[in-house]
């Protein structure tokens, strides 16, 4: 039985598979922050997480998705003041008894160092310092990611 | 280049419902957050509210009981109603792109809407 | 009345600097770096001058700057310009998803 918030997750995310594929971004859009191979942006409004989720859909992008502690401390050096949180695209699975990434994977256990319970309508937000589970029904901030296409260098025959 | 174009009728009656009408041109309207402003005559600007096309809407709380906004993403429209207006309504209303919710970078040119019988 | 308090007006000679004040409270201009201008001449829309305190959207001239100190934030105009006669408004978040205005002040360019 799946929860309210993985019936969201789910259904936004297999609605933005079914979109025609689009041609690959090259440069972040206005007010997105570029890290690495990744466009960033973060909200200045508030809200729960799965409209903070819908939110994201909607810019053709999703919420925030971390691979390792080295993306995450560089995500953390752009958040400028150490009071906020941020909604990133994790929350817990009550099937699965897990941490899910919104794109259908688990939360690798090394991977980031979560304070507080992992249960029934947790979600995860980022401070400047620290990784929390809060209540999917807080109204915090969030963060959208868009994926950069990596150019290619030309490769020019001998003149 | 973002163009809003704002319409509907410029004279409602008081105690009716106001209904305005924003058109984007030039973007896509999903990405951003839309936002209804308004200026009575000389005077000052008053943040009416917004709406997002995930279907959210924030409404300044002076207004919140008389507001209701909402989006129609085919047609690339931003739609205010203001209902049990009286003359204190009278005023330009604009339409403005709401990036992230916490600034405006791009207006409408502006509608006179009188409240008058 | 304007949640944010600015002078009705100020002044100043072509080629000086005029500086434009907007006070608020801990729960809006002194709670988040989120303060906006824009600039109005009569009978038209406003101009997005400044956001975030200081940045400059593109096509916005370097004479305009913004910055906050406490819970005011200010625009200053330099080298100041005929054109740039006009009714100036802040604006700041003020949280739960907020938005408020100053009352506007006129600049006249004498």
């Known amino acids: 039985q799946k929860s309210s918030i993985e019936k969201c997750s789910v259904d936004i995310q297999q609605s933005r598979n079914k979109t025609t594929e689009r041609p690959g971004l090259l440069n972040c859009p206005i007010y997105w922050q570029q890290l690495r191979e990744k466009c960033l942006l973060f909200s200045h409004t508030v809200n729960p997480w799965n409209n903070s989720l819908a939110d994201c859909s909607t810019k053709e992008s999703s919420l925030l998705l971390i691979r390792d502690k080295d993306e995450l401390i560089h995500t953390q050096n752009l958040i400028r003041d150490k009071a906020i949180l941020f909604w990133i695209g994790l929350n817990f699975s009550l099937s699965e008894k897990n941490w899910k990434w919104i794109n259908g994977s688990f939360l690798n256990s090394n991977d980031l160092e979560i304070r507080g319970d992992a249960k029934e309508n947790s979600c995860i937000s980022i401070s400047q310092t620290s990784v929390y589970s809060e209540y999917c029904s807080t109204e915090i901030r969030w963060i959208c990611q868009k994926e950069l296409t990596p150019v290619r260098n030309k490769v020019y025959p001998d003149s | 280049q973002v163009q809003l174009q704002e319409s509907g009728p410029g004279l409602v009656k008081p105690s009716e419902t106001l209904s305005l009408t924003c058109t984007v041109s030039?973007?896509?309207?999903?990405?951003?957050?839309w936002s209804w402003i308004r200026q009575p005559a000389g005077k000052g600007l008053e943040w009416i509210g917004r709406?997002?096309?995930?279907?959210?809407?924030n409404y300044n709380p002076s207004l919140k009981s008389r507001v209701t906004m909402s989006v129609d993403t085919s047609k690339k429209q931003i739609s205010l109603k203001l209902s049990s207006v009286t003359a204190a309504d009278t005023a330009v209303y604009y339409c403005?792109?709401?990036?992230?919710?916490?600034?405006?970078?791009?207006w409408g040119q502006g509608i006179l809407v009188t409240v008058s019988s | 009345q304007s949640a944010l308090t600015q002078p009705p007006s100020a002044s100043g000679s072509p080629g000086q600097s005029v500086t434009i004040s907007c006070t608020g409270t801990?729960?809006?201009?002194?709670?988040?770096?989120?303060v906006s201008w824009y600039q109005q001449h009569p009978g038209k829309a406003p101009k997005f001058m400044i956001y975030?305190?200081?940045k400059r959207p593109s096509g916005v001239p370097d004479r305009f700057s913004g910055s906050k100190s406490g819970n005011t934030a200010s625009l200053t105009v330099s080298g100041l310009q005929a054109e740039d006669e006009a009714d100036y408004y802040c604006?700041?978040?003020?949280?739960?998803?907020?938005?408020?205005f100053g009352g506007g002040t006129k600049l006249t360019v004498l």
């Open positions: 975030e305190v200081s």
């Open positions: 604006s700041s978040y003020a949280g739960i998803n907020n938005v408020v």
């Open positions: 403005a792109r709401d990036p992230l919710g916490t600034f405006f970078d791009y």
């Open positions: 801990s729960s809006d201009v002194g709670g988040y770096n989120y």
């Open positions: 030039g973007d896509s309207i999903n990405s951003y957050y």
């Open positions: 709406t997002y096309t995930s279907g959210s809407t």
